[in-house]
C-alpha cells in the first residue's frame, strides 16, 4: 500500500532572467527512493538515479542544474518556462509518486513564492 505523500513548492513565480529551485519531498513512507525524474509537460528535463547519479537532458544543459538535493534549479528563465513541472519519485517497494509544481515567469520584479501544498 502506498502511504507516502509528496510535498512540493506549490505554485511559484519568478522573474524573467532569474533562477528558481524546484523542490519536492517524499514523506510518510519508508520506501527507498531509487530514481527521481523532473519533467516539464511531456519533456524529460533530468533524472537523478540512486546508482547512476544525475543526467540532464542535453537540450536543457545550459539552463538546468542538478540540486540542491533531489531538486532542480532552472536558470536564465524566460516566459516560455511558465507551466507545469512534475517530480516523479520511483520507489521500492511502493512504486511511483508524482508531485506537481506550477511556475509562472513574470516580467515584473514582484514575483513571490506561493504557498506549499501536498499531493497524496
Amino acid at each position: 500500500m502506498m502511504t507516502g505523500t509528496i510535498e512540493t513548492t506549490g505554485n511559484i513565480s519568478a522573474e524573467k532572467g532569474g533562477s528558481i529551485i524546484l523542490q519536492c519531498h517524499l514523506s510518510s513512507t519508508t520506501a527507498q527512493v531509487t530514481q527521481v525524474n523532473w519533467e516539464q509537460q511531456d519533456q524529460l528535463l533530468a533524472i537523478c538515479n540512486a546508482d547512476l547519479g544525475w543526467h540532464i537532458s542535453p537540450s536543457f544543459k545550459d539552463r538546468v542544474a542538478p540540486g540542491p538535493g533531489l531538486g532542480l534549479t532552472l536558470q536564465s528563465l524566460t516566459v516560455n518556462d511558465t507551466g507545469e513541472y512534475f517530480c516523479i519519485y520511483h520507489t521500492y517497494p511502493d512504486g511511483t509518486y508524482t508531485g506537481r509544481i506550477f511556475l509562472e515567469v513574470l516580467e515584473s520584479s514582484v514575483a513571490e513564492h506561493g504557498a506549499r501544498f501536498q499531493i497524496p
Epitope: 530514481q35 538515479n49 537532458s57 544543459k61
Partner: antibody, heavy 117, light 107 residues
Framework: EVQLQESGPGLVKPSETLSLTCAAS?????????WHWIRQPPGKKLEWMGF???????VYNPSLKGRITISHDTSKNQFSLKLSSVTAADTAVYFC??????????WGQGTTVTVSS | DIQMTQSPSSLSASVGDRVTITCRTS??????LAWYQQKPGKVPKLLIY???TLAEGVPSRFSGSGSGTDFTLTISSLQPEDVATYYC?????????FGQGTKLEIK
C-alpha cells in the same frame, strides 16, 4: 552527424593493461550526454563497462571496479578506457557509445582486442 | 544486479509474419527498457527506449510494450532486412545490463 571511432592495440598480453581511445566527431563531448564503453566477448552478450560524464565524473560496473579507468581529453574530443590485469576473459569487441539517460543512441564501429601471450 | 532474461533465444519466421520477443527482468524497472538490433558483423543499433519510444529512423513495424518486469518487442510484418540478433537493456541502475539476445532468422 555524430561519429565515434575506437582505436588501440588489437593484442594485449595477460596481466597487462588494455588501453583504448574513442574519438568523437560531429559533437563535443562536453556538451551533454554520457560517454560509455561496452564490450562483447566472442559469441556472447553485450556487457556495459562504465561511462564518463561531460563533467569528467565516472561511473563503473561494480564487476570491473579496481581494474577500470575511464578518462577524457576534451582538447582532442576523445575519451579513453584502461583495463588493468587483463586475462583471456577480457578478449572481446570493445565499443564506445554515446548515452542519453543511460541508453545508447550512437555507437562506434567496435575494435577487437585479444588477450594472449 | 538486475537480471535480463530474453525468450526465445532464437526463432525462425516467414516474411510478413508478426514476430514477438520477450524480455523479463528480475526486479521492477518501471518503463526503463531499451531494445537494440545487431545485424551479423555489425554494430548494435538503438530501436526503442523507455519501453515504447521508437528511436529516430526506425520503421514503424517495430513496437515495444510492457512495464515493471515484463516487456515485449514486436515486429508487425517481418522483412528480410530484419534478420539480426535483438537485445534488451535496462536503463535504470548500476550495472546497466543486457539480455542474452534473440537471434531472428527468416524461414
Amino acid at each position: 552527424e555524430v561519429q565515434l571511432q575506437e582505436s588501440g592495440p588489437g593484442l594485449v598480453k595477460p596481466s597487462e593493461t588494455l588501453s583504448l581511445t574513442c574519438a568523437a566527431s560531429g559533437y563535443s563531448i562536453t556538451s551533454g550526454y554520457d560517454w560509455h564503453w561496452i564490450r562483447q566477448p566472442p559469441g556472447k552478450k553485450l556487457e556495459w563497462m562504465g561511462f564518463i560524464r561531460d563533467s569528467g565524473s565516472t561511473v563503473y560496473n561494480p564487476s570491473l571496479k579496481g581494474r577500470i579507468t575511464i578518462s577524457h581529453d576534451t582538447s582532442k574530443n576523445q575519451f579513453s578506457l584502461k583495463l588493468s590485469s587483463v586475462t583471456a576473459a577480457d578478449t572481446a569487441v570493445y565499443f564506445c557509445a554515446r548515452g542519453l539517460f543511460w541508453y545508447f543512441d550512437v555507437w562506434g564501429q567496435g575494435t577487437t582486442v585479444t588477450v594472449s601471450s | 544486479d538486475i537480471q535480463m532474461t530474453q525468450s526465445p533465444s532464437s526463432l525462425s519466421a516467414s516474411v510478413g509474419d508478426r514476430v514477438t520477443i520477450t524480455c523479463r527482468t528480475s526486479e521492477n524497472i518501471f518503463s526503463y527498457l531499451a531494445w537494440y538490433q545487431q545485424k551479423p558483423g555489425k554494430v548494435p543499433k538503438l530501436l526503442i527506449y523507455n519501453t515504447k519510444t521508437l528511436a529516430e529512423g526506425v520503421p514503424s513495424r517495430f513496437s515495444g510494450s510492457g512495464s515493471g518486469t515484463d516487456f515485449t518487442l514486436t515486429i508487425s510484418s517481418l522483412q528480410p532486412e530484419d534478420v539480426a540478433t535483438y537485445y534488451c537493456q535496462h536503463h535504470y541502475g548500476n550495472p546497466l545490463t543486457f539480455g542474452q539476445g534473440t537471434k531472428l532468422e527468416i524461414k
